[in-house]
């Protein structure tokens, strides 16, 4: 059976297509090509007489067609108007005609696309951005890429307008991109230049560094403030509520106890109009901000009740500290038999009684810090029960 085949079926505009003929019958008088799905004299492209090997252009001939002795038809420099059906009529020597229809599709060579946007400076968490891939062309597939990857599944991403428009709902600072669109058809593909979003955000709550609270007199106080923000935040400092300066860094040399107080960093974003503050307390003191763990020692840890006495000593190398004692979570002294001496470093119990058995510990502290010793256990024994009514124990 007579058939035709388009080589290629999808043709790029400006290129050429060959309509190949298969199963051409023998004993031919000639053949004719027509534009369309049927034989129509008004739409004849070319006729060919085998006897004379003569090609005769028809009304639909554009001068770009070449017919070959094997009946194949070459069309050069194709346009989108050439898309469609082509019919070959074969005239046999017995004047019985055979027909075959083929087709091809012409697609444009796609230009480099570009991305337009409805909002070049969106505000985080509020604005939506619609990207549109230009130009709009027929029979074209539109694809989008974010960070060189295909679109993730997200309720914040919407495709519309035949995938030509990508909308980001409620943009975040992580949505900067880059964004690219790609257009494809069966004969070509092209990708846009990348576009990035300038997302306005912040300021976030500022952080003041370093984190130290305690400083010694004579030291230099150097504080730095940072808040994530786009555009970058403008900073100002207040000390105890009084404005000091509009800088990111605050430096005070040779501080004294008078520099103690609340230090406020104020961050402002002039575009979003938002402000955030952080307050840090600074304490300037000779006192050690970290009190070492004291050691507790006992003259004896096992004593005889109503007979022995015991001395407990709390040792520390820190100066400017105070000491307090605890027994079974109660503050001491708790009876006439307990005495504190040597600046509370020593706790004396005389005499020791049964109720004094248990866990003791001491705590050293200054106005800004404290620390506790490990506990020590005092055991109280009774060698014999006291005699009553002249009777011996037993």
């Amino acid at each position: 059976q007579l058939t035709t085949e388009s080589m290629p079926f999808n043709v790029a505009e400006g290129k050429e297509v060959l309509l190949l003929v298969h199963n051409l019958p023998q004993q031919l008088f000639g053949y004719s090509w027509y534009k369309g799905e049927r034989v129509d004299g008004n739409r004849q492209i070319v006729g060919y007489a085998i006897g004379t090997q003569q090609a005769t252009p028809g009304p639909a001939n554009s001068g770009r067609e070449t017919i070959y002795p094997n009946a194949s038809l070459l069309i050069q420099n194709v346009t989108q108007n050439d898309t469609g059906f082509y019919t070959l009529q074969v005239i046999k020597s017995d004047l019985v005609n055979e027909e075959a229809t083929g087709q091809f599709h012409v697609y444009p060579e796609l230009p480099k696309p570009s991305i337009s946007s409805n909002n070049s400076n969106p505000v985080e968490d509020k604005d939506a951005v619609a990207f549109t891939c230009e130009p709009e062309t027929q029979d074209t597939t539109y694809l989008w890429w974010i960070n060189n990857q295909s679109l993730p599944v997200s309720p914040r991403l919407q495709l519309s307008n035949g995938n030509r428009t990508l909308t980001l709902l409620s943009v975040t600072r992580n949505d900067t991109g880059p964004y690219e669109c790609e257009i494809q058809n069966p004969v070509s593909a092209n990708r846009s230049d990348p576009v990035t979003l300038n997302v306005t955000y912040g300021p976030d709550t500022p952080t003041i560094s370093p984190s130290d609270t305690y400083y010694r007199p004579g030291a230099n106080l150097s504080l730095s403030c940072y808040a994530a923000s786009n555009p970058p935040a403008q900073y100002s400092w207040l000390i105890n509520g009084t404005f000091q300066q509009s800088t990111q860094e605050l430096f005070i040399p040779n501080i004294t106890v008078n520099n103690s107080g609340s230090y406020t960093c104020h961050a402002n974003n002039s575009v979003t109009g938002c402000n955030r503050t952080t307050v840090k307390t600074i304490i300037v003191t000779e006192l050690s901000p970290v009190v070492a763990k004291p050691q507790i020692k006992a003259s004896k840890t096992t004593v005889t009740g109503d007979k022995d006495s015991v001395n407990l000593t709390c040792s520390t190398n820190d100066t400017g500290i105070s000491i307090r004692w605890f027994f079974k979570n109660q503050s001491l002294p708790s009876s006439e038999r307990m005495k504190l001496s040597q600046g509370n470093t020593t706790l004396s119990i005389n005499p020791v009684k049964r109720e004094d058995a248990g866990t003791y510990w001491c705590e050293v502290f200054n106005p800004i810090s404290k620390n506790q010793s490990d506990p020590i256990m005092l055991n109280v024994n009774y060698n014999a029960l006291p005699q009553e009514n002249g009777l011996s124990p037993g």
Epitope: N118, E136, G273
Partner: antibody
Framework: EVQLVQSGAEVKKPGESLKISCKGS????????IGWVRQMPGKGLEWMGI????????RYSPSFQGQVTISADKSISTAYLQWSSLKASDTAMYYC??????????????WGQGTLVTVSS | DIQMTQSPSSLSASVGDRVTITCRAS??????LNWYQQKPGKAPKLLIY???SLQSGVPSRFSGSGSGTDFTLTISSLQPEDFATYYC?????????FGQGTKVEIK
């Protein structure tokens, strides 16, 4: 039920100031934008601007920038439109409307009943 | 600013008629077009959002289509309560802009 209730009609003289209100209820007032739309007598609709009550972010139409001030008080779920010095050409019906989810790519799905402002000497 | 042009500015129709109103944007607005209905002395009411999505509670005789620059509002069978003025509005970019309106009157 979502409702936007606007303050009543006003008759003012040129040069006077005015602040009209729009109170939202039945939804999270701070999560939606509130837009203002002007309709002059016998004319079409004109978008004036929009505010996000959550943080008072405001966007104006260039035609109305500097002519009016849009504000909001989220503690009482109310948006405002104000003039510092009225002109006779400000005579119109003013509508507030709820916008979602952004200042753009949105729709105005609920409208107030309108406030008629008449400026005449 | 994006200009929105509606046509016709007014039309006369009978109950049961199929009515079509068109709206053209001065630049591509993707599918970010809304349609509103306004009756005399009343606030506008949202009918269609995002070019073709029917707002909750709006009768199905209203439909919208189009993308890019050309959009259409269709009322498949006009009812007595549909006589009103219809506005298109783009929400692609600020300032949001409305068409000049189309008044649908009783023939």
């Amino acid at each position: 039920e979502v409702q936007l209730v606007q303050s009543g009609a006003e008759v003012k003289k040129p040069g006077e100031s005015l602040k009209i209100s729009c109170k939202g209820s039945g939804y999270s007032f701070t999560s939606y934008w509130i837009g203002w739309v002007r309709q002059m007598p016998g004319k079409g609709l004109e978008w004036m601007g929009i505010i996000y009550p959550g943080d008072s972010d405001t966007r104006y139409s260039p035609s109305f920038q500097g002519q009016v001030t849009i504000s909001a008080d989220k503690s009482i779920s109310t948006a405002y439109l104000q003039w510092s010095s009225l002109k006779a050409s400000d005579t119109a019906m003013y509508y507030c409307a709820r916008g979602y989810p952004a200042p753009t790519v949105n729709d105005l799905d609920y409208w107030g009943q309108g406030t008629l402002v008449t400026v005449s000497s | 600013d994006i200009q929105m042009t509606q046509s016709p500015s007014s039309l006369s129709a009978s109950v049961g008629d199929r009515v079509t109103i068109t709206c053209r944007a001065s630049q591509s607005i993707s599918s970010y077009l809304n349609w509103y209905q306004q009756k005399p002395g009343k606030a506008p009411k949202l009918l269609i959002y995002a070019a073709s999505s029917l707002q909750s509670g709006v009768p199905s005789r209203f439909s919208g289509s189009g993308s890019g620059t050309d959009f259409t509002l269709t009322i498949s069978s006009l009812q007595p309560e549909d006589f009103a003025t219809y506005y298109c509005q783009q929400s692609y970019s600020t300032p949001l802009t409305f068409g000049q309106g189309t008044k649908v009157e009783i023939k």
